[in-house]
């Protein structure tokens, strides 16, 4: 029985050239998190594996940084980074939980950064 829920930063915006933290948090379950995938619809950005550590996809190595926690930091943002991002939590014994974040990268300096939180 999967009882957990994923909380995310939801819809967030950031300035072109800036950085943003993508953050998900799994709650309401005692399941053990064994791996977290960070993805776009057809691209793997990074994986954090409990045994193997972090893996950043080579095409994102220059502007993706692991953390904080199980989150992901995107740097040197471009307008092309606008879109959906997914955190995929692999857990034992529950299975897989998924959260979605929509990022809008704005040209102007009035971009409002969405609420952020750290994984305890």
């Amino acid at each position: 029985m999967m009882t957990g829920t994923i909380e995310t930063t939801g819809n967030i915006s950031a300035e072109k050239g800036g950085s943003i933290i993508l953050q998900c948090h799994l709650s309401s379950t005692t399941a053990q998190v064994t791996q977290v995938n960070w993805e776009q619809q057809d691209q793997l950005l990074a994986i954090c594996n409990a045994d193997l550590g972090w893996h950043i996809s080579p095409s994102f190595k220059d502007r993706v940084a692991p953390g904080p926690g199980l989150g992901l930091t995107l740097q040197s943002l471009t307008v092309n980074d606008t879109g959906e991002y997914f955190c995929i939590y692999h857990t034992y014994p529950d299975g897989t939980y998924t959260g979605r974040i929509f990022l809008e990268v704005l040209e102007s300096s009035v971009a409002e950064h969405g609420a952020r939180f750290q994984i305890p």
Epitope: Q35, E39, Q41, D42, Q43, I47, N49, S57, I88, T96
Partner: antibody, heavy 118, light 107 residues
């Protein structure tokens, strides 16, 4: 429980366009996920052809160049495959499949055999 | 494109045997590999994702391991219904690609 069902002509002439439809029941294709076409020539392995996402974004296998088009009819909860300029090498079982975010395929249709022959 | 090379291409075994199939990726895919079972005239069935995770309902005799470029799929004790063709697939980047398959036959 989501179910996928392929339909379309079982025989297509060389140089013509192959057209298939996948009807999805038990889940709206506009709610989530990416909806894919995967084919398997007789006695051979699997080839991913492309997808249309719940938002309408498409992605294709470059090996099929510009021959493939995937579209959808949200009113019928269907998505479709068109493959142009077919040859005998396009003879295959064509599957529609729902992709999970991680790039794997937990749900498939039963497949439909399309033969390209004159 | 990332090539996935499976071995062996065919394998004969008996009920109760432990069977191992390997898959080698042409580049580092970390843990982004899935395994499928396909029976004649049927669609593939997902058995393993992310190298080692079993979807709900898949028997525990099926397991996967590996990371980087080398991956292993194991059936700990073959059952009569396990005789089929098995495919690996990389889920690291598009175009998603499959191995050529391993046909598991009754000895």
């Amino acid at each position: 429980q989501v179910q996928l069902q392929e339909s379309g002509p079982g025989l297509v002439k060389p140089s013509q366009t192959l057209s298939l439809t996948c009807t999805v029941s038990g889940y709206s294709i506009t709610d989530d996920y990416a909806w894919n076409w995967i084919r398997q020539p007789p006695g051979k392995g699997l080839e991913w052809m492309g997808y249309i996402s719940y938002s309408g974004h498409t992605k294709y296998n470059p090996s099929l160049k510009s021959r493939v088009t995937i579209s959808r009819d949200t009113s019928k909860n269907q998505f479709s495959l068109k493959l142009s300029s077919v040859t005998a090498a396009d003879t295959a079982v064509y599957y529609c499949a729902r992709k999970y975010y991680g790039g794997w395929f937990p749900r498939w249709g039963q497949g439909t055999l399309v033969t390209v022959s004159s | 494109d990332i090539q996935m090379t499976q071995s062996p291409s065919s394998l004969s075994a008996s009920v109760g045997d432990r069977v191992t199939i390997t898959c080698k990726a042409s580049q580092d895919v970390f843990t982004a590999v899935a395994w499928y079972q396909q029976k004649p005239g049927k669609a593939p069935k997902l058995l393993i994702y992310s190298a080692s995770y079993r979807p709900t309902g898949v028997p525990s005799r099926f397991s996967g391991s590996g990371s980087g470029t080398d991956f292993t799929f194991t059936i700990s004790s073959l059952q009569p219904e396990d005789f089929a063709t098995y495919y690996c697939q990389q889920s690291y980047s598009t175009p998603w690609t499959f191995g050529q398959g391993t046909r598991l036959e009754i000895k």
